[in-house]
Interface confidence: low
Amino acid sequence: AGVFELQIHSFGPGPGPGAPRSPCSARLPCRLFFRVCLKPGLSEEAAESPCALGAALSARGPVYTEQPGAPAPDLPLPDGLLQVPFRDAWPGTFSFIIETWREELGDQIGGPAWSLLARVAGRRRLAAGGPWARDIQRAGAWELRFSYRARCEPPAVGTACTRLCRPRSAPSRCGPGLRPCAPLEDECEAPLVCRAGCSPEHGFCEQPGECRCLEGWTGPLCTVPVSTSSCLSPRGPSSATTGCLVPGPGPCDGNPCANGGSCSETPRSFECTCPRGFYGLRCEVSGVTCADGPCFNGGLCVGGADPDSAYICHCPPGFQGSNCEKRVDRCSLQPCRNGGLCLDLGHALRCRCRAGFAGPRCEHDLDDCAGRACANGGTCVEGGGAHRCSCALGFGGRDCRERADPCAARPCAHGGRCYAHFSGLVCACAPGYMGARCEFPVHPDGASALPAAPPGLRPGDPQRYL
């Protein structure tokens, strides 16, 4: 057993440009508080998965009112540590979520309003009993500085708080089979205190409160001999006396689930089904009630008036999870049509539509040419959310308002001279060339030289020249 301790040092604007606006104002004073959630292991768990190692809320910080015109400073913090007690071994590796919450203190209908300012998360390795580790995490434009440590509660010691120590009875040495408890050399390792009633002959424990059975024994206190029918059990080593398989200690032997939880084996370990009002890996965390304010993001807490009855959080739109702690990524459903950009504003979804589309979900295809006139006889062509004018000869530009010089591109080949004409352009070809653009040489016999046929076609076969 032990305690995880978190010390928040500062919460304020991070370095660099784009300093955040102060979360409080003269009109709307507020104060901060923090929530920490701990989970064992280094797995990337979903935000709404239970805080199996425990969770804690800080006290509320001092009321803060922004000074007009002043940049957002480091905000005043609650006093004291956030402490998360753990009953079992410290896992050594853990994941954390630290949330910074704002409590608005203006004239709110129905009491103060809470909103999540920032959430940081990480995965760390940490030995119990070690020094304070320090960390800096950034969430958007905010920066959170904090330190943390895990410490064992006496008589537990060690990097996992699984060894027990007690004062030495003699100054020179510990009892038989017991080592000194480094670094507390004046203390000795204490024998593990197994679950009350655990058979001293047939049971043992690796953690306080456990009762694991030796081969051939079962039951919560290892007092029940395994019947011969268990020879059919696939688990455990072969027994020399009976010649059949005897179950070895299983993960549910001795029922590791506290507070009346029921244990079921899983392929790798065990799983506790906890009674109402308890949660945690071994149902070790006592019940949370609505009085503890477990529902975040404006969730409504129902039930849970006493620790024995569970609470339910009814989440506002955009949030989910047992504590409304997870923001729903509603944009992942791609609600915006026709390539619109989805914006989840928390209280609502917004679609930013591409040109030519409109509507809450960009579902309306606008008539691109509606109200758009193409000048000088040009015709409007719709396409891709933008209008385009196909201009009459002699005109150009987006709306065909510019008079085009058809000869500007020097369209007449082989030295031909270009003349602008009301219907377009005319090429006066140099001697020896012919065609609308003077592109074909004239043979001495008077026949024009057509381009050579592509491979596989005979001259004279019908073909198009582009």
Epitope: H9, D74, G130, R134
Partner: antibody, heavy 122, light 107 residues
Framework: QVQLVQSGAEVKKPGASVKVSCKAS????????ITWVRQAPGQGLEWMGD?????????NYNEKFKSRVTMTRDTSTSTVYMELSSLRSEDTAVYYC??????????????WGQGTLVTVSS | EIVLTQSPATLSLSPGERATLSCRAS??????LHWYQQKPGQAPRLLIY???QSISGIPARFSGSGSGTDFTLTISSLEPEDFAVYYC?????????FGGGTKLEIK
């Protein structure tokens, strides 16, 4: 500019205690760790521990000194204190306070006090 | 605890020469190593942090390298004011420890 100004030299008898002060200025006092390092005459540097002034309870001590050293702070005067008890002659040294840089989360010490000579002699 | 061994204990060189100071850790300290300079009667001064990261105000002739257990501080061309004692420090694990120092003296 950042400055760490330490208290003056002390002469103590074995078994007594000494309390060295380190007054910080030129930066936000509560946002930087202060560490204590000592240097015996003609010897190298030895880390004693550190304290986060934003929270007086947040300290790390070298196990070698853990039973004898206490680090505290007074935010009203931006001062950190290091008290060493049960003094012995081998505690004669110059005691430095230093500010730990926050660059990259390093524990490196970027600003140092001028040092306080503590002499333990009977 | 992690022991840092600096070598040589004393290095005699002339101004303009290149100085190479070594620091070896008893076990891997990743890149958690810093270098300090100390002159007689003065407090140490941070030169390099995290093996090779330079500190503003420190001349560019000071550079650091290495990883794991072997680290080097190099002074490319010695100036008269560079003659001092140099310490390495590890911040990989507790307690934080310093090397015994290398005294750089004028030849």
């Amino acid at each position: 500019q950042v400055q760490l100004v330490q208290s003056g030299a002390e002469v103590k008898k074995p078994g007594a205690s000494v309390k060295v002060s380190c007054k910080a200025s030129g930066y936000t006092f509560i946002s930087y760790w202060i560490t204590w390092v000592r240097q015996a005459p003609g010897q190298g540097l030895e880390w004693m521990g550190d304290i986060y002034p934003g929270s007086g309870s947040t300290t790390n001590y070298n196990e070698k000194f853990k039973s004898r050293v206490t680090m505290t702070r007074d935010t009203s005067t931006s001062t950190v204190y290091m008290e060493l008890s049960s003094l012995r002659s081998e505690d004669t040294a110059v005691y430095y306070c230093a500010r730990e840089t926050t660059v990259g989360g390093a524990y490196a010490m970027d600003y140092w006090g001028q040092g306080t000579l503590v002499t333990v002699s009977s | 605890e992690i022991v840092l061994t600096q070598s040589p204990a004393t290095l005699s060189l002339s101004p303009g020469e290149r100085a190479t100071l070594s620091c070896r850790a008893s076990q891997s300290i990743n890149n958690n190593l810093h270098w300090y300079q100390q002159k007689p009667g003065q407090a140490p001064r941070l030169l390099i942090y995290y093996v090779s990261q330079s500190i503003s105000g420190i001349p560019a002739r000071f550079s650091g390298s290495g990883s794991g257990t072997d680290f080097t501080l190099t002074i490319s061309s010695l100036e008269p004011e560079d003659f001092a004692v140099y310490y390495c420090q590890q911040t990989n694990s507790w307690p934080l420890t310093f090397g015994g120092g290398t005294k750089l003296e004028i030849k």
